[in-house]
Interface confidence: low
């Protein structure tokens, strides 16, 4: 039975040409987190592998960067990098659990952060 | 109801070839990364190989790179594993996995296929 939680960053905003930090965090369970995947809809950003360590995807190397902790950097954003994006955590004997948090990059200065949501 | 299947796997000789197929089939609005899994008696399950949605290839595990090429076919949600010059600790059972949408408002949902063994023979 899979009883843990996602919390992730929710939604957030960030400015263009800025950095952003991507986390979540896997609550209410003892399973092992044996490799969180990072993705968009569409694409494969990075893998943190608990044995292997990091793997970031070759079209992102120069603008991703590995961590705080299980996290995720993205630098120099653009608007084009606006979406949903997905953490998705790897586990034993649990399965999987994916949190979802959507980023927003604005032209302006004013970049708000959004709340923190949980998802089950 | 999404479901994954996966076919071509078998008895094969060490330096022999395989391809594996995994078929998507049910309400899929869309399959982002779909990927290649194995998992051998005693061992944790491994992330082999995946790619995205437009082809491009995310990732290969290091002990198959330049033996097996994954590649996708997305009119028909299918996701192969060309697999060659295969060698005894390639043995393991090779499990497809894609995060599938099947509506505009929720988060992709992680779908497992059952697997299919794959055996290499020294």
């Known amino acids: 039975m899979m009883t843990g939680t996602i919390e992730t960053t929710g939604n957030i905003s960030a400015e263009k040409g800025g950095s952003i930090i991507l986390q979540c965090h896997l609550s209410s369970t003892t399973a092992q987190v044996t490799q969180v995947n990072w993705e968009q809809q569409d694409q494969l950003l990075a893998i943190c592998n608990a044995d292997l360590g990091w793997h970031i995807s070759p079209s992102f190397k120069d603008r991703v960067a590995p961590g705080p902790g299980l996290g995720l950097t993205l630098q120099s954003l653009t608007v084009n990098d606006t979406g949903e994006y997905f953490c998705i955590y790897h586990t034993y004997p649990d399965g999987t659990y994916t949190g979802r948090i959507f980023l927003e990059v604005l032209e302006s200065s004013v970049a708000e952060h959004g709340a923190r949501f949980q998802i089950p | 109801q999404v479901k994954l299947e996966e076919s071509g796997g078998g008895l094969v000789q060490a330096g022999g070839s395989l391809r594996l197929s995994c078929a998507a089939s049910?309400?899929?609005?869309?399959?982002?990364?779909m990927r290649w899994y194995r998992q051998a008696p005693g061992k944790q399950r491994e992330l082999v190989a995946s790619?995205?949605?437009?082809?491009?290839?995310?990732y290969y595990i290091d002990s198959v790179k330049g033996r097996f090429t994954i590649s996708r076919d997305n009119a028909k949600n299918i996701v192969y594993l060309d697999m060659r010059s295969l060698e005894p600790a390639d043995t393991a059972v090779y499990l497809c996995?894609?995060?599938?949408?099947?509506?505009?408002?929720?988060?992709?949902?992680?779908?497992w296929g059952h697997g299919t063994q794959v055996t290499v023979s020294s």
């Open positions: 996995n894609a995060n599938i949408r099947t509506d505009m408002r929720s988060a992709p949902f992680d779908h």
């Open positions: 049910g309400s899929i609005l869309s399959a982002g990364v």
């Open positions: 790619i995205a949605l437009d082809g491009s290839t995310g």
